[in-house]
């Protein structure tokens, strides 16, 4: 996360942002918090983006003021108005696009003073993989599928039993471009698997890391999956 302090005027307030990632075609959140003020009408929130002439969003006197908003953000932004009073200046961004990536600044004015902090926003695509027994294969195989990734990720298989094993020789991964010509479907097949072993399919790019686990026994199939956004360090 990044903490910024106001440098102009008599007083400065602490503003904190969290570097985050947006999944294209979905809602995104640009996170920003500040020292609260007791009077909503005294709070001004301005979101700016480097290289963009107009404002991304402005909230003042208790409501949105979009008179100086840049066209590329028209109808796509909102603050959480009921949470501004408690110091939440986070911005909701509709229909995240690749072009939304960049450096944003959250600038705050309250009766206590001014402050700002920068935020690096990455955009791409990421999704949770689903691992299944591959019924099409001649030998016992696992199939790991994730519908949307961008940029192209790496795929690594791992086993709970043989933790240091390299499965690249016994797996095959393909990337299929989705109809919108940006994101790709990831499919990876792991061959010659043994039962009563937990296998993990790990998909990772510079934005996110997702894992799909599967354990096949004689009586059941257990699955588990999770997704983690890779936030970069504060600068």
């Amino acid at each position: 996360f990044i903490i910024g302090f106001g440098i102009s005027g008599r007083h400065s307030i602490t503003v904190t942002t969290l570097t985050s990632a947006g999944n294209i075609g979905e809602d995104g959140i640009l996170s920003c918090t500040f020292e609260p003020d007791i009077k909503l009408s005294d709070i001004v929130i301005q979101w700016l983006k480097e290289g963009v002439t107009g404002l991304v969003h402005e909230f003042k006197k208790g409501k949105d003021d979009l008179s100086d908003q840049d066209e590329m953000f028209r109808g796509r932004t909102a603050v959480f108005a009921d949470q501004v009073i408690v110091g939440n200046a986070s911005l909701r961004l509709k229909n995240v696009q690749l072009t939304d990536a960049g450096t944003y600044k959250c600038y705050i004015i309250t009766s206590k003073g001014k402050g700002n902090a920068k935020l690096e926003y990455k955009t791409g695509a990421f999704s949770i993989p689903e691992v299944n027994v591959d019924s099409n294969a001649s030998s016992e195989s696992l199939r790991c599928e994730a519908p949307r990734w961008f940029p192209q990720p790496t795929v690594v298989w791992a086993s709970q039993v043989d933790q240091g094993a390299n499965f690249s020789e016994v797996s095959n991964t393909s990337f299929e471009l989705n109809p919108e010509n940006v994101t790709m479907k990831v499919v990876s097949v792991l061959y010659n698997v043994t039962i009563n072993t937990t296998y993990s399919c790990m998909i990772e790019n510079d934005i996110a890391k997702a894992t799909g686990d599967i354990r096949v026994t004689d009586s059941e199939i257990k699955r588990q999956s999770h997704l983690q956004l890779l936030n970069s360090k504060a600068s």
Epitope: G25, D65, K94
Partner: antibody, heavy 121, light 107 residues
Framework: EVQLVQSGAEVKKPGASVKVSCKAS????????IGWVRQAPGQGLEWIGD????????NYNEKFKGRVTITRDTSTSTAYLELSSLRSEDTAVYYC??????????????WGQGTLVTVSS | DIQMTQSPSSLSASVGDRVTITCKAS??????VAWYQQKPGKAPKLLIY???TLQPGVPSRFSGSGSGRDYTLTISSLQPEDFATYYC?????????FGQGTKVEIK
């Protein structure tokens, strides 16, 4: 409670114009987009366009560009749809609807009762 | 402009049936698909938005799913009050677009 109350039915001649009003109450009028949708008899829903009352920004369906104007009066919390050069195929029920999500253009979550516009010579 | 192709245009079903209606976007991808129910002489009612989020007060038998270009509205067990016309709406882009509608009738 969010309420959108539309003006009454209209009968117009081909080539004329019609202006339908939509008075909003129960929320901050300037903070939410308002959209307009029409439905011809026995037909489906057709999006016409929308307006952000806080700034007067508009978006229009290409099909209606040049014939439709969406405006608002913030002092009375009223949005207006004006359609010119009317033809018989403009006969429809016209709905206004509030878009969810404040300044963010969301789905239409609250609707007016509809205004029937009949175009007949 | 994005077009939404909805199918079927009509269907006959009985109370208790599972009903599925689909919408296919002509291009692009985003989660901004909503579903509406409309009864004769009434304004549409929002059921689901953002692909799968149920509008407050809407019964849980209604559900939405989908990704990419394909979206689905499912009624798990059709009730007498569910006989109506259903529309999908794409609202992710600058220009919004409705599907053509699906009329759900009593078999």
């Amino acid at each position: 409670e969010v309420q959108l109350v539309q003006s009454g039915a209209e009968v117009k001649k081909p080539g004329a114009s019609v202006k339908v009003s939509c008075k909003a109450s129960g929320y901050t009028f300037t903070s939410y987009w308002i959209g307009w949708v029409r439905q011809a008899p026995g037909q489906g829903l057709e999006w016409i366009g929308d307006i952000y009352p806080g700034g007067g920004y508009t978006n229009y369906n290409e099909k209606f560009k040049g014939r439709v104007t969406i405006t608002r009066d913030t002092s009375t919390s009223t949005a207006y749809l004006e359609l010119s050069s009317l033809r018989s195929e403009d006969t429809a029920v016209y709905y206004c609807a509030r878009l969810d999500g404040s300044s963010y253009r969301g789905a239409m979550d609250s609707w007016g009762q509809g205004t029937l516009v009949t175009v007949s010579s | 402009d994005i077009q939404m192709t909805q199918s079927p245009s009509s269907l006959s079903a009985s109370v208790g049936d599972r009903v599925t209606i689909t919408c296919k976007a002509s291009q692009g991808f985003n989660k901004y698909v909503a579903w509406y129910q409309q009864k004769p002489g009434k304004a549409p009612k929002l059921l689901i938005y953002y692909t799968s989020t149920l509008q407050p007060g809407v019964p849980s038998r209604f559900s939405g799913s989908g990704s990419g270009r394909d979206y689905t509205l499912t009624i798990s067990s059709l009730q007498p009050e569910d006989f109506a016309t259903y529309y999908c709406l794409q609202y992710g882009n600058l220009l919004y677009a409705f599907g053509q509608g699906t009329k759900v009738e009593i078999k």
